[in-house]
C-alpha cells in the first residue's frame, strides 16, 4: 500500500527472500507517515513491509550482507 512513493501500510504476507532483489528504507521523519522497508522484487514490484517484524529484519540482514560481500 503506497502512495506518492510513501508506504501507507504493510503487507500481511511473508515474502520469500528468493523473490527480493533489494530494499529501500522509508523513514517517518523524512516526509512519510510511517517507518517501512520497501522490498523490490524480481517482478519489479515494490512491497511495503513492517520493519518491526522478524522476517523483515532477517531479509534486510541477508541483503545487506550480500551487498557487503560484493
Amino acid at each position: 500500500a503506497s502512495n506518492f512513493d510513501c508506504c501507507l501500510g504493510y503487507t500481511d504476507r511473508i515474502l520469500h527472500p528468493k523473490f527480493i532483489v533489494g530494499f529501500t528504507r522509508q523513514l517517518a521523519n523524512e516526509g512519510c507517515d510511517i517507518n517501512a522497508i520497501i522490498f523490490h522484487t524480481k517482478k519489479k514490484l515494490s512491497v511495503c513491509a513492517n520493519p518491526k517484524q522478524t522476517w523483515v529484519k532477517y531479509i534486510v540482514r541477508l541483503l545487506s550482507k550480500k551487498v557487503k560481500n560484493m
Epitope: 511473508i14 518491526k52 517484524q53 522478524t54 522476517w55 529484519k57 532477517y58 534486510v60 545487506s64
Partner: antibody, heavy 120, light 110 residues
Framework: QVQLQQSGAEVKKPGSSVKVSCKAS????????ISWVRQAPGQGLEWMGG????????DYAQKFQGRVTITADESTSTAYMELTGLRSEDTAMYYC?????????????WGRGTMVTVSS | QSVLTQPPSASGTPGQRVTISCSGS????????VNWYKQLPGTAPKLLIY???QRPSGVPDRFSASKSGTSASLAISGLQSEDEADYYC???????????FGGGTKVTVL
C-alpha cells in the same frame, strides 16, 4: 504444547567440532524462526545465529561467522547447530529457541539446553 | 560488554516493588520492540514480556514493562520468593543488524 527437544551433553577436545540438534513438536516448524543462543557459565545470553526453515537460509552473528553452521530439516522438524574449531571459551550451555516471524525477537519457546564442555 | 546495559543486581523484600532498567541507543530500543526474559537458576530462559509491554498468557500481572526513548524498564510489584531469578532485556540492533541481549540482572528476594 510446543516442545523443543535438544540432544545430550557433549565433552569435546579443543580443535574438534560439535553438532547439537533441536527437534520441535506440537507446532508448525516452518512458520517460525529457530535461533541458537549460548550462555557461558555465570554469563549472559549471546545470539549465535538462526534459520527460518521456510526460507532455508541460515544467518550468523559476525562473531561466529565461518565457525558455525545452522541447518534445518523440515521433514523431521529438526534444527542443527554445528560449531567447529572448538576452544575452551566455547564451553557453554547452548539453547535453541523458537521465534515469531511477525513479532520481533520474541522467543516464545526454548529447549532445555545442551551443555558443551571443551577440555583437553 | 553488552549493547544493552542492565544493572547487575537488584533486590527487595517480599511485597516490595523492584524495577530493572535496560539502557540502549537510537539503533536498538528506540526503534525496535523490547522483550524480557526470566531465567531461574539451572533452567532455560522464559519469555516474560514481548512487544515492549505485552504479557504472554500465564505471566502474572505483577510483571509490567514500559519503554521511553532509548530505555526500557521491567517492574515487579508484590515481590515473591519465586521471582528470584536473572532477568534479561532483548531487542534488535539496526546498526549491528542482529538481535542483542542485555547483560542480565540478578533479582534477590531478601
Amino acid at each position: 504444547q510446543v516442545q523443543l527437544q535438544q540432544s545430550g551433553a557433549e565433552v569435546k577436545k579443543p580443535g574438534s567440532s560439535v553438532k547439537v540438534s533441536c527437534k520441535a513438536s506440537g507446532g508448525t516448524f516452518s512458520s517460525y524462526a529457530i535461533s541458537w543462543v549460548r550462555q557461558a557459565p555465570g554469563q549472559g545470553l549471546e545470539w549465535m545465529g538462526g534459520i527460518i526453515p521456510t526460507f532455508g537460509i541460515a544467518d550468523y552473528a559476525q562473531k561466529f561467522q565461518g565457525r558455525v553452521t545452522i541447518t534445518a530439516d523440515e521433514s523431521t522438524s529438526t534444527a542443527y547447530m554445528e560449531l567447529t574449531g572448538l576452544r575452551s571459551e566455547d564451553t557453554a550451555m547452548y539453547y535453541c529457541a523458537r521465534g515469531q516471524l511477525e513479532r520481533l525477537g520474541e522467543y516464545d519457546y526454548w529447549g532445555r539446553g545442551t551443555m558443551v564442555t571443551v577440555s583437553s | 560488554q553488552s549493547v544493552l546495559t542492565q544493572p547487575p543486581s537488584a533486590s527487595g523484600t517480599p511485597g516490595q516493588r523492584v524495577t530493572i532498567s535496560c539502557s540502549g541507543s537510537s539503533s536498538n530500543i528506540e526503534i525496535n520492540t523490547v522483550n524480557w526474559y526470566k531465567q531461574l537458576p539451572g533452567t532455560a530462559p522464559k519469555l516474560l514480556i514481548y512487544s515492549d509491554y505485552q504479557r504472554p498468557s500465564g505471566v502474572p500481572d505483577r510483571f509490567s514493562a514500559s519503554k521511553s526513548g532509548t530505555s526500557a524498564s521491567l517492574a515487579i510489584s508484590g515481590l515473591q520468593s519465586e521471582d528470584e531469578a536473572d532477568y534479561y532485556c532483548a531487542t534488535w540492533d539496526d546498526s549491528l543488524n542482529g538481535p542483542v541481549f542485555g547483560g542480565g540482572t540478578k533479582v534477590t528476594v531478601l
